[in-house]
Structures are given as C-alpha cells and as structure tokens.
C-alpha cells in the first residue's frame, strides 16, 4: 500500500491522543536504555510503511502484536485516514485469523514495540534535513 495520500495530521492526532499511550502502557517496566532504534524512516509515508510492517507482520519471536490495543487503533486510524487502505488489508486479515496465537509478551516483542515507538516519534516530527 502507498501511504502518500493519507491524512497525516489526522493520523498524528490519533497517535498522540490514543496510540502513543497504548504503546507506553505496553512498554511499562522496560528500561529506556534497553533497546536501540535500528529501524528508521525518512518521511511520513515511509514511516507509515515501516509502522505497518512492524505492527502487523509477524516476525520470529513475536507473532502477536496485531491483537494489541495499539495495533487495533493503528489499523483503525489507517483505515479511516488512508484512502483504500481497508481493501488492501482484507486478505492479510483473513490470513492472520488462520494463524492466530495466544498473546505472549516476549523480549522480542518489547524490542519490536520499542522500534515502533521510535518510528511513531519520527512520524510525529519528520522535520530534519540531513547536514
């Protein structure tokens, strides 16, 4: 999906009002020194591409993020504010239902959500020019 035509300001508002709080709740008890952000993004469409990938694509050691509150709110925001996004997700959602697993917060998941927090920070404030 190409995120270029999303309403970025509306997504940013959804992030600040709810998604960010759910991310913080998920990470509560984790040391702020624990994870270095290794995934980065250069502009808002790129940030949303990376956010979608990390939130909804199961990875080795962390298969359960899509059912977390922040993920459901992310999905809702993208569905509302990115034209045509919902249609692209129907097949992916059906495939995910088939391999649904119980929620387990692993260290790998915590690391992944730490990366997500970093991506959302950069989505929120994509203002830097390279020197």
């Amino acid at each position: 999906y190409d995120f270029t035509n999303c309403d970025f300001e509306k997504i940013k508002a959804a992030y600040l009002s709810t998604i960010s709080k759910d991310l913080i709740t998920y990470m509560s008890g984790t040391k702020s020194t624990e994870f270095n952000n290794t995934v980065s993004c250069s502009n808002r469409p790129h940030c949303l591409t990376e956010i979608q990938s990390l939130t909804f694509n199961p990875t080795a050691g962390c298969a359960s993020l899509a059912k977390e509150m922040f993920a459901m709110k992310t999905k809702a925001a993208l569905a509302i504010w990115c034209p045509g996004y919902s249609e692209t997700q129907i097949n992916a959602t059906q495939a995910m239902k088939k391999r649904r697993k119980r929620k387990v917060t692993t260290n790998k998941c915590l690391e992944q959500v730490s990366q997500l927090q970093g991506l959302w920070r950069r989505f929120n404030r994509p203002l830097l020019k390279q020197q």
Partner: antibody, heavy 119, light 107 residues
Framework: QVQLQQSGAELVRPGTSVKVSCKAS????????IDWVKQRPGQGLEWIGV????????NFNEKFKGKATLTADKSSSTAYMQLSSLTSEDSAVYFC????????????WGQGTLVTVSA | DIQMTQTSSSLSASLGDRVTISCRAS??????LNWYQQKPDGTVKLLIY???TLHSGVPSRFSGSGSGTDYSLTISNLEQEDIATYFC?????????FGGGTKLEIK
C-alpha cells in the same frame, strides 16, 4: 533515570565563539532528538534548533542559522552547540532538552549553561 | 512565526487555591500546545503535552485544556512546590515558539 548534564558557565569575548556540551545518560542516546533553547536574563524561551543524534540531521530557527552549529558524538552520548561571532545579544542561559517519549514537547532539560559575552 | 501570548506575566494566589494560567496563539495550533514549569533555581520540567496529556510523574492536580488558539493550564490545589514560572509552547509549526511566561507567587 534520564539526565542531561551541561558544561559550565562561560565568559567570552565579543567576536569569538563558544561550544556548549550536553552529556546524556539514562536512555539510548540515538533514539531521541535533542533541542536547544535560549533564555536571556529575565526573559522568555527561544527555540534555537534540533539535532537527530543518530543521523546528524538538523533543523534551525531561521533566526539562529549561521549563529548556531549543532553536532552530536554518539560514542560519548554528547550533543554540542557552537555559537559563533558572539555579541552581547548572545549573553543568555542555553538549555539542551530531549524530546518526549511520543515526540511531542521537551521532556527532559539540562540545567542550563550561562554564556556571558563581555569585553 | 506563531506568536504565543500569556496575558498575565504574574499571578498571586493562596495555597489550596485553584489557579488558571492562559495562553493564546496568533493562529490555530491544532492542540499542539505544551506547558512547562521553571523553578526559581532555573530547572525546567515538561508538565503537559498535546494540550491535556500529563507527562509521566506530573501530579494530577495539573490539567490542561483548550483548542484552536486559546489554551489554559489549571492547578487545582496550589501547593508550595508549585511556585514557579509557567511557559506555554506551540509545537504545530516551525519555529517552535514559547509564551512570555507567567510567574506564580504566594499571596
């Protein structure tokens, strides 16, 4: 806990330059932007600019372009601001501040560095 | 640049009072309004971001509200440790700009 430790007060001559440091601890240095803010005696706060310690990317308030240079040293988790061609207008307390967890607002501040420009 | 105006440069109140500090932006800032506390020794703390979200560790007696161009910070039950100068800051448009500050004093 998150801490930003700034270098000590500086008394400098007009026309020279000064470099203020801001050593970060208690968090992953490259994960968060660091902003710099100016406060003249008895006055309000002015945003100077921001650096991404991970990439070295910067952005400035137009008013401080050519005046301030922002850099960061990942190995020592230290951000720097150099001020050049100093005049009495540059006499102020300078703060470094780290952005919040969500990237909105300046969540953690250094104690400030007083720069006095005087002949 | 967006101008941020804090109409009261100083306010006097008694301990236990409810205190409201106001801040006005020269244009709509879409709730991207943050509040800071600067103690007499110069230390600065973030209190509230995005109009009404309390930063971690900030007492619940602090609250923020507003929209468009008009915003306010309320301290519901003034304590001695709240004696400080309070600044608003807009994060909507570069360059970020601050209000002139409101110094809170005890009657």
């Amino acid at each position: 806990q998150v801490q930003l430790q700034q270098s000590g007060a500086e008394l400098v001559r007009p026309g020279t330059s000064v470099k203020v440091s801001c050593k970060a601890s208690g968090y992953a240095f490259t994960n968060y932007f660091i902003d710099w803010v100016k406060q003249r005696p008895g006055q309000g706060l002015e945003w100077i600019g921001v650096i991404n310690p991970g990439s070295g990317g910067t952005n400035f308030n137009e008013k401080f372009k050519g005046k301030a240079t922002l850099t960061a040293d990942k190995s020592s988790s230290t951000a720097y601001m150099q001020l050049s061609s100093l005049t009495s207008e540059d006499s102020a307390v300078y703060f470094c501040a780290r952005e919040s967890e969500v990237g909105e607002g300046f969540a953690y501040w250094g104690q400030g560095t007083l720069v006095t420009v005087s002949a | 640049d967006i101008q941020m105006t804090q109409t009261s440069s100083s306010l006097s109140a008694s301990l236990g009072d409810r205190v409201t500090i106001s801040c006005r932006a020269s244009q709509d800032i879409s709730n991207y309004l943050n509040w800071y506390q600067q103690k007499p020794d110069g230390t600065v703390k973030l209190l509230i971001y995005y109009t009404s979200t309390l930063h971690s560790g900030v007492p619940s007696r602090f609250s923020g509200s507003g929209s468009g161009t008009d915003y306010s910070l309320t301290i519901s039950n003034l304590e001695q440790e709240d004696i400080a100068t309070y600044f608003c800051q807009q994060g909507n448009t570069l360059p970020y700009t601050f209000g002139g500050g409101t110094k809170l004093e005890i009657k």
